[in-house]
């Protein structure tokens, strides 16, 4: 059982492993994977991890490339956990409105919005 | 048929309407709505709009409060459109890896990650 690694450290390590194994991963020239056409990544986590699954099934395993896919699986687990927390707490309307206001505020300032 | 309004302008107007109608919206003292417990809003769009639906069904309609819910419905439509674009384009592995790297980079720098 691996020692618990903080998610932030896990993401950093995964970025490094992705860079290390890039040549191996792109070896399959004919493989096509769905790629989101916008940068609001959080909306596309399902498709991203489906793509990772496709890639894993087409990649020769062994060594640290296994570690890469293991990390990606742990990141998926973290995100699934976050999604579960979307509806956990039932609160008064004023609190829901404050969250909605924050959501729209972030959408207003940080999302990449195409007309 | 209303004139198309850019989504960014729609979000701004909705924020203003939300502020205007707050007192009316919070009048139901006993209503409880699920509130996400983290700031990664994009992961929770489904729950947020379910909450909006609950609120709309409990709110006396009329005047500009209808405009608020209409706007929120258009924002949902925009987000649903963005979600459809998550899996539309099938690309070569190197392009998928670029997107994955960007996704992890954003997760590394912008997400609020609790250990």
């Amino acid at each position: 059982i691996p020692t618990e690694i903080p998610t932030s450290a896990l993401v950093k390590e995964t970025l490094a492993l992705l860079s290390t194994h890039r040549t191996l991963l792109i070896a399959n020239e004919t493989l096509r994977i769905p790629v989101p056409v916008h940068k609001n990544h959080q909306l596309c986590t399902e498709e991203i991890f489906q793509g990772i699954g496709t890639l894993e099934s087409q990649t020769v395993q062994g060594g640290t490339v296994e570690r890469l896919f293991k990390n990606l699986s742990l990141i998926k687990k973290y995100i699934d956990g976050q999604k579960k927390k979307c509806g956990e707490e039932r609160r008064r309307v004023n609190q829901f409105l404050d969250y909605l206001q924050e959501f729209l505020g972030v959408m207003n300032t940080e999302w990449i919005i195409e007309s | 048929i209303p004139t198309e309004i850019p989504t960014s302008a729609l979000v701004k107007e909705t924020l203003a309407l939300l502020s205007t109608h707050r007192t009316l919206l919070i009048a139901n003292e006993t209503l409880r709505i699920p509130v996400p417990v983290h700031k990664n809003h994009q992961l929770c769009t489904e729950e947020i709009f379910q909450g909006i639906g609950t609120l709309e069904s409990q709110t006396v309609q009329g005047g500009t409060v209808e405009r608020l819910f209409k706007n929120l419905s258009l924002i949902k439509k925009y987000i649903d459109g963005q979600k459809k674009k998550c899996g539309e384009e099938r690309r070569r592995v190197n392009q998928f890896l670029d997107y994955l790297q960007e996704f992890l980079g954003v997760m590394n720098t912008e997400w609020i990650i609790e250990s």
Epitope: N94, E102 | K39
Partner: antibody, heavy 117, light 109 residues
Framework: QVQLQESGPGLVKPSQTLSLTCTVS??????????WSWIRQHPGKGLEWIGY???????YYNPSLKSRVTISVDTSKNQFSLKLSSVTAADTAVYYC?????????WGQGTLVTVSS | SYVLTQPPSVSVAPGQTARITCGGN??????VYWYQQKPGQAPVLVVH???DRPSGIPERFSGSNSGNTATLTISRVEVGDEADYSC???????????FGGGTKLTVLG
């Protein structure tokens, strides 16, 4: 289990500003399910709500104190703070910080602040 | 702004039933929360949403709310129940929290 701990000076001079900080452990202050609140209790009296803040920065204050109160949040330190300006002896009280969902779920142990010259 | 009125004190013998009231205009349309506070300690929630008990609170504690009065009832009162009890509501017109003045429960004995 969420834990809250108040910190700050126990003695403040009249006309000065009372400053307290509440450190939250066991949960992120960015938890959208909570407001973060300050309450005080004058010696031998009932509870008085001072105000609360959402992680986004939205604040709500008791109208009777509004002109003197500022509550702020520091998500990076998992803390929120209270500033009460132009204090008088009438502001002598035990000050509590608390997490506020639909009700006050978790409380700090309270800190006594005395206003005296 | 909204005002909650509680009696300053209530006395009861052990084993009897104590009733602590909290008055407010049309309080029956609001959710009421009750807190117990023992000397030198922070308050603890004993009843939420009018009549629901948090886990760990004895069944002897119950609540009701209608019209202009909410009531906290403590049956089979024990010496350890001696404390201050405060009611709380939200004033939805302003998003403000309102506390009652508190009631000191004395267990005679």
């Amino acid at each position: 289990q969420v834990q809250l701990q108040e910190s700050g000076p126990g003695l403040v001079k009249p006309s000065q500003t009372l400053s307290l900080t509440c450190t939250v452990s066991g949960d992120s202050i960015s938890n959208g399910g909570y407001y973060w609140s300050w309450i005080r209790q004058h010696p031998g009296k009932g509870l008085e709500w001072i105000g609360y803040i959402y992680y986004s920065g939205s604040t709500y204050y008791n109208p009777s104190l509004k002109s003197r109160v500022t509550i702020s949040v520091d998500t990076s330190k998992n803390q929120f703070s209270l500033k009460l300006s132009s204090v008088t002896a009438a502001d002598t009280a035990v000050y509590y910080c608390a997490s506020l969902g639909n009700w006050f779920d978790y409380w700090g142990q309270g800190t006594l602040v005395t206003v005296s010259s | 702004s909204y005002v909650l009125t509680q009696p300053p004190s209530v006395s009861v013998a052990p084993g009897q039933t104590a009733r602590i009231t909290c008055g407010g205009n049309n309080i029956g349309s609001k959710n009421v929360y009750w807190y117990q506070q023992k000397p030198g300690q922070a308050p603890v929630l004993v009843v939420h949403d009018d009549s629901d008990r948090p886990s760990g609170i004895p069944e002897r504690f119950s609540g009701s709310n209608s019209g202009n009065t909410a009531t906290l009832t403590i049956s089979r009162v024990e010496v350890g129940d001696e404390a201050d009890y405060s009611c709380q509501v939200w004033d939805s017109s302003s998003d403000h929290v309102v506390f009652g003045g508190g009631t000191k429960l004395t267990v005679l004995g």
